[in-house]
Interface confidence: low
């Protein structure tokens, strides 16, 4: 099943990323370089959607370096099949699952003054099934709550507060949310979770609700890059991937990210006993996207440079803020009762050879169904 | 390569002021602490206190707030320790040293300086 | 603060003994650092986060031990091993060093 997984990634968007740009890893190491003592936490699928979304009404030099930001390479695809392709995986995330709570969303706030193309707006609507708004940014206050009681409704109360503060001089807003919340195939027992020791760094102690349970899960150890590997399946298609590099290793694993080796440690994973122990957190990253990307290449569309003619007649408007928020939350509930003890025996030797592995200091995570729908660093929980 | 490089020795006066510095190499100040350790001859190792440059708060051993001073230059990207009001039992060797992120705090140490109070 | 007590506070050891050093804390603290130190030289970290050996130091150190109680154990002593050892706590400030154990060799 884990095999099965690999042969179907895309790594951040549906179609083959060429050499040249590894979108999601690239994204990650300017997030990191920005700030290597917090934590980080992004969707890579969801961000390549709305940037493809936001090709749809660009031109020229404008869609080309968006299309080449995403690393994506039109030689071997259409247009209309990247933008088919993202259709159907909006469709296929947005279904409703058991145990499976995802709101995924995009929205396009625009001043009052700008009229959109019509052609746009429906691509848009069909496709990304994304809402636009006229909005009054003269008045920054409601324009705020606006776009923030939109997201919040989305989200049903999930995500608040996506602005912190509004430009009054801004023309296009372009907000990008996802919220995950699943049910692990077999749950953490309440009863094993207690407040232990995370080194935030290894003079900062904070105490975290520790959740523990031994099993058999997909494991491995990477001599490499100095780290350990752990696959966590969510019920339905998703696992999540939790990365404990090696103490003092931390900046070569995330060198390390890349498509290659997300893929290696997919094919790689073997099953293993371990007494797992796994804090328990909400984690949530909030990004200025248009601060990030121009380090990636895609730089136009937020200047007076920006091509958007498809998006509306007016000739000057770009892009004044692109802001995207993921928040999950990862607690010790399943699908499936864990054993009372919190231990699963098989036979005796497989319990002898358990290993312990213990999240106590930062450690990175993937969420991954057939794309990656997160990538973090918990540097704190 | 990680290196810390401490000023030399010095040879100070009762009731005098010293600042001692520790100029870092093969890293940016910025984004680790910066530790001072005091060991008197023949004792053990104490610890003073460190900087996080990146948070702006400095920590001391309540023993030596007040008495101690640490301060940093992130353009010259050196530590400083200021020992005033000197008197024979602050006659030791004082060591700066890294922590913070990624590797093990305290993996590198600078090579110490010797301090001497004498009349 | 927290005091940590090492003992023996001074001790001999034959080549190829087996030597064990303690660290016991005046509360509980969540790992336990050791250093050693050689006349003349500044301190080296020897063993983190209770039982990590530092790069370049040989697999016949080990550290364990958890709560209130740590210890450092050499499994067959060496020549080369004559030195000071101190334990440090990192679990709350201000951080903390045993006094120290001066071992020998015989």
């Known amino acids: 099943e884990m095999k099965k997984r690999v042969e179907d990634l895309h790594v951040g968007a549906t179609v083959a990323p060429s050499s040249r740009r590894d979108f999601t890893f690239d994204l990650y190491r300017a997030l990191a370089s920005a700030a290597p003592s917090q934590s980080i936490f992004f969707s890579p699928v969801s961000i390549s959607m709305s940037l493809a979304m936001l090709s749809l009404g660009a031109g020229s030099s404008t869609k080309m370096q968006i299309l080449e930001g995403l690393g994506l390479n039109l030689q071997k695809s259409s247009e209309k099949e990247l933008h088919r392709g993202f259709q159907q995986l909006l469709q296929e995330l947005n279904q409703p699952r058991d145990g499976f709570q995802l709101s995924l969303g995009n929205a396009l706030f625009t001043d009052l003054v700008v009229d959109l193309q019509d052609t746009f707006v429906s691509a848009m609507k069909t496709l990304y099934l994304a809402d636009t708004f006229p909005t009054n940014f003269r008045d920054s206050a409601g324009a705020m709550k606006q776009i923030n009681d939109y997201v919040a409704k989305q989200t049903k109360g999930k995500i608040v507060d996506l602005l912190k503060n509004l430009d009054s001089n801004a023309v296009v807003i372009m907000v990008n949310y996802i919220f995950f919340k699943a049910k692990w195939e077999t749950s953490f027992n309440h009863k094993g979770t207690q407040e232990q020791d995370f080194y935030v760094t290894s003079e900062t102690v904070v105490r975290v609700p520790m959740m523990s349970r031994e099993d058999q899960y997909h494991y491995l150890l990477d001599r490499n890059l100095s780290c350990r590997v752990v696959g966590v399946p969510y019920q339905g298609n998703a696992t999540a991937l939790f990365i404990l590099p090696s103490e003092g290793k931390m900046q070569q694993v995330e060198n390390g990210l890349s498509e290659k080796t997300l893929r290696k440690w997919l094919k790689m994973f073997k099953k293993r006993q371990l007494e797992l122990y796994l804090p328990k957190f909400s984690i949530e990253g909030s990004y200025q996207l248009e601060k990030v990307l121009p380090s990636l290449g895609i730089s136009n569309v937020f200047t007076s440079h920006a091509d958007l003619s498809g998006i509306s007649n007016h000739s000057n408007i770009q892009v004044s803020e692109m802001v995207h928020k993921a928040v999950v939350e990862v607690d010790e509930s399943g699908t499936r009762a864990a054993a009372a003890t919190g231990t699963i025996f098989t036979f005796r030797s497989a319990r002898l050879n358990s290993q312990r592995l213990v999240f106590n200091r930062p450690f990175l995570m993937f969420i991954v169904d057939n794309n990656i729908l997160f990538l973090g660093k918990v540097n704190r929980p | 390569e990680v290196q810390l490089q401490q000023s030399g020795a010095e040879l100070v006066r009762p009731g005098a002021l010293v600042k001692l510095s520790c100029k870092a190499s093969g890293f940016n100040i910025k984004d680790y602490y910066i530790h001072w350790v005091k060991q008197r001859p023949e004792q053990g190792l104490e610890w003073i206190g460190r900087i996080d440059l990146e948070k702006g708060n400095i920590i001391y051993d309540p023993k030596f707030q007040g008495k101690d001073n640490i301060t940093a230059d992130t353009s010259s990207n050196t530590a400083y320790l200021q020992l005033s009001s000197l008197t024979s039992e602050d006659t030791a060797v004082y060591y700066c040293a890294r922590g913070g992120y990624d590797v093990p705090s305290f993996a590198y140490w600078g090579q110490g300086t010797l301090v001497t109070v004498s009349a | 603060q927290i005091v940590l007590t090492q003992s023996p506070a001074i001790m001999s050891a034959s080549p190829g003994e087996k030597v064990t050093i303690t660290c016991s804390a005046s509360s509980s603290v969540s790992y336990m650092h050791w250093f050693q130190q050689k006349p003349g030289t500044s301190p080296k970290l020897w063993i983190y986060s209770t039982s990590n050996l530092a790069s370049g130091v040989p697999a016949r150190f080990s550290g364990s031990g958890s709560g209130t109680s740590y210890s450092l154990t050499i499994s067959r002593m060496e020549a080369e091993d004559a030195a000071t050892y101190y334990c440090?706590?990192?679990?709350?400030?201000?951080?903390?060093f045993g006094s120290g154990t001066k071992l020998e060799i015989k």
């Open positions: 440090q706590q990192r679990s709350s400030y201000p951080f903390t």
